[in-house]
């Protein structure tokens, strides 16, 4: 019994005066607490308590469940205890089979003994299976067996407390260890689509998938720069142990323009947090925006190829596309395809392939596209660059020499005189009249230029050259002069094309 100095309050004394007492099942337990300021007896086993206000605790017929710690407390709060074992060969263990362990922490298998004199108090696997090699434990007959540093691999481990009694192994009831994992990484979050485009009144629904080791992971949908509570629905699955998946679905049944913005799926656990965002754009009606990928005014050389290319954004999806020239619709020579295979793609490409263009094929080429809400179009003005062609070269009745040439860009006509038999005509002659004539062909066709000179200016035999040229090339026509006396002979025109 404890001893204290005179004058100081002392703890109560208990009879019998020993720390442990062993009684047989069916025998009497009689414990006396002596203290002038006696308050109560408390009995505790498996962390449950009972109280008794009598100073003598009497149990006439002891049962195994009377095993436990008996504590007497006085009015000063001082106490003294005795541990009683009620030896029952039929019930060697008292148990509480609730067994939870936190990863990396210790956990107690609650199987205190009713007989401290048994041996080899330990843990055993169920059905004769061995325990994990790294499982360490510390037995305490009054409390149970402490498993040290629980591992995730021990989850759903089946255990028995075990003792040897009279040479035989005796097992307790089964314990199933349920391990709560420690978070050792942030949650993994992903979103069904990174962006959404909707018309007013359509339903917005987006799903966030959260993956972690347990359902204790926290997740929520948040609207950036807003505290508004969003309506979410959840589905969750355990794909085996420590592989938990939750799908959090956010829905706005009838989206409005002012619902547009960035929505964040946020998840956190005790290790850290992760988030992913999706962007919602709500438009009051659908749209089509066309972007030419080349200049809408196109210059191309005669006989060459050109591709007219547009990109366009269409929402909802485009329903009709066509290329038109001179009120005729192309049935081939063009292709239309989505810019990407992404589910949320709204960008498309259309290409018209014009091959070996002729000078007569210049003009306006129009791309038209429509969806259920709008129509849109874009026009390309195509000019075919052609080398000048001399249409006519004549001596007029008034003595004028006239040269008419067509080409694109507009040809320039220069005149040259070559005296005698010289091949090179270098002396330029100024025209009397130059006119650009209106072409009777389609717009964007060749431009026609007419130039005239006065033949009376020439006094000697020779050749007059009419040279028509532009950026593409040049062409010449020649007039030959022969004088007999004072009379000018017939002028013989001929042409010589030069590249």
């Amino acid at each position: 019994q404890p001893s204290v100095s005179p004058g100081e309050p002392s703890p109560p004394s208990i009879h019998p005066g020993k720390s442990d007492l062993i009684v047989r099942v069916g025998d009497e337990i009689r414990l006396l607490c002596t203290d002038p300021g006696f308050v109560k007896w408390t009995f505790e086993i498996l962390d449950e308590t009972n109280e008794n206000k009598q100073n003598e605790w009497i149990t006439e017929k002891a049962e195994a469940t009377n095993t436990g710690k008996y504590t007497c407390t006085n009015k000063h709060g001082l106490s003294n205890s005795i541990y009683v074992f009620v030896r029952d060969p039929a019930k060697l263990f008292l148990v509480d089979r609730s067994l939870y362990g936190k990863e990396d922490n210790d956990t107690l298998v609650r199987c205190p003994l009713t007989d401290p004199e048994v041996t080899n108090y330990s843990l055993k696997g169920c059905q004769g299976k061995p325990l994990p090699k790294d499982l360490r434990f510390i037995p305490d007959p009054k409390a149970g067996i402490m498993i040290k540093s629980v591992k995730r691999a021990y989850h759903r481990l089946c255990l028995h407390c075990s003792v040897d009694q009279e040479g035989k192994s005796v097992l307790s009831e089964k314990f199933i260890l349920k391990v709560r994992p420690a978070f050792k990484a942030v949650p993994v979050v992903s979103v069904s689509k990174a962006s959404y485009l909707l018309r007013e009144g359509e339903e917005f629904t987006v799903t966030c998938t959260i993956k972690d080791v347990s359902s204790s992971v926290y997740s929520t949908w948040k609207r950036e720069n807003s505290q508004t509570k969003l309506q979410e629905k959840y589905n969750s699955w355990h794909h085996g142990d420590f592989n938990y998946e939750r799908q959090a679905t956010l829905t706005i049944s009838s989206a409005r323009v002012n619902d547009s913005g960035v929505f964040m799926c946020y998840a956190n656990n005790t290790f850290g947090s992760a988030n992913v965002t999706t962007t919602l754009e709500v438009v009051d009606k659908g749209f089509i925006n066309i972007f030419p990928m080349i200049n809408t005014t196109v210059f191309v050389n005669d006989g060459e190829n050109v591709d007219l290319i547009v990109e366009y954004e269409a929402f909802p999806k485009p329903e009709h596309q066509q290329w038109i020239y001179m009120n005729r619709t192309f049935t081939d020579k063009w292709e239309d395809y989505p810019k990407s295979e992404n589910e949320s793609n709204i960008r498309y490409v259309s290409e018209l392939h014009l091959t070996r263009l002729k000078g007569t094929e210049g003009g306006t080429y129009t791309f038209l596209v429509s969806n259920s809400d709008v129509n849109a179009a874009i026009a390309f003005n195509v000019y075919v660059n052609t080398k000048p062609e001399i249409l006519t070269y004549d001596r007029l009745v008034n003595g004028m020499l006239q040269c008419v040439a067509a080409g694109f860009p507009e040809p320039t006509i220069d005149w040259y005189f070559c005296p005698g038999t010289e091949q090179r005509c270098s002396a330029s002659v100024l025209p009397v009249d130059v006119q650009t004539l209106n072409s009777s062909g389609p717009p964007f066709g060749k431009l026609v230029v007419q130039s005239s000179i006065d033949s009376s200016a020439f006094k000697h035999n020779g050749t007059v050259e009419c040279k028509a040229y532009n950026d593409v090339g040049k062409t010449s026509a020649y007039f030959n002069f022969a004088f007999k006396g004072n009379n000018k002979e017939q002028i013989h025109p001929h042409t010589l094309f030069t590249p």
Partner: antibody, heavy 117, light 111 residues
Framework: QVQLVQSGAEVKKPGASVKVSCKAS????????MHWVRQAPGQGLEWMGV????????SYNQKFKGRVTMTTDTSTSTAYMELRSLTSDDTAVYYC??????????WGQGTLVTVSA | EIVLTQSPSSLSASVGDRVTITCRAS??????????MHWYQQKPGKAPKLLIY???NLESGVPSRFSGSGSGTDFTLTISSLQPEDFATYYC?????????FGQGTKLEIK
């Protein structure tokens, strides 16, 4: 003699929060898990979550995720359950229940929470 | 989550009758042959009271006319001879897997 004594009935407005207490006696408070279960009028029982013994870890039913918080005060052997953003659907009797030997062997008397505008 | 479906949802019986209530789980609640299934009784305005734990164990203080059986996904609560105080609502509950779940209840009424 294990006892769980809960706080009294509460009337709350939609959007408010409620915090129900559950004072335990007759056992070592830190040695047992405490669960919370609710029952709407005329309906069945619904598990809300658990606060584990020892370190205060929690596990919540995802239905209440983000709205519920379970805590304990070991100095007074009291468990608490707070539910936020209340709606009329949260009108129910809320019970605390101690888990012992795998089952809910002890229950509080229940706390009626009425959510009404 | 594990869904528990009780049948019947309600039942009329007389004092002295033998009554059986079944509870079917959407997946097994067993681990190593231990069934994490429990049965509770609830009377109006009262907290639930544990009757049977781990499928077949009678809780201390509960009359022996109550018994439980079953394993895996199918479980049964039997009352061998109904007494007047047994008219109440009965719930099965599993705690094999989080979230713990209850059956929808079986209301036992006097015929």
């Amino acid at each position: 003699q294990v006892q769980l004594v809960q706080s009294g009935a509460e009337v709350k407005k939609p959007g408010a929060s409620v915090k129900v207490s559950c004072k335990a006696s007759g056992y070592t408070f830190t040695s047992y898990n405490m669960h919370w279960v609710r029952q709407a009028p005329g309906q069945g029982l619904e598990w809300m979550g658990v606060i584990y013994s020892g370190n205060g870890d929690t596990s919540y039913n995802q239905k209440f995720k983000g709205r519920v918080t379970m805590t304990t005060d070991t100095s007074t052997s009291t468990a608490y359950m707070e539910l936020r953003s209340l709606t009329s659907d949260d009108t129910a009797v809320y019970y605390c229940a101690r888990e012992r030997d795998t089952r809910f062997g002890n229950w509080g008397q229940g706390t009626l929470v009425t959510v009404s505008a | 989550e594990i869904v528990l479906t009780q049948s019947p949802s309600s039942l009329s019986a007389s004092v002295g009758d033998r009554v059986t209530i079944t509870c079917r789980a959407s997946e097994s609640v067993d681990i190593y042959g231990q069934s994490f299934m429990h049965w509770y009784q609830q009377k109006p305005g009262k907290a639930p009271k544990l009757l049977i734990y781990l499928a077949s164990n009678l809780e201390s203080g509960v009359p022996s006319r109550f018994s439980g059986s079953g394993s895996g996904t199918d479980f049964t609560l039997t009352i061998s001879s109904l007494q007047p105080e047994d008219f109440a609502t009965y719930y099965c509950q599993q705690n094999n897997e989080d979230p713990y779940t209850f059956g929808q209840g079986t209301k036992l009424e006097i015929k």
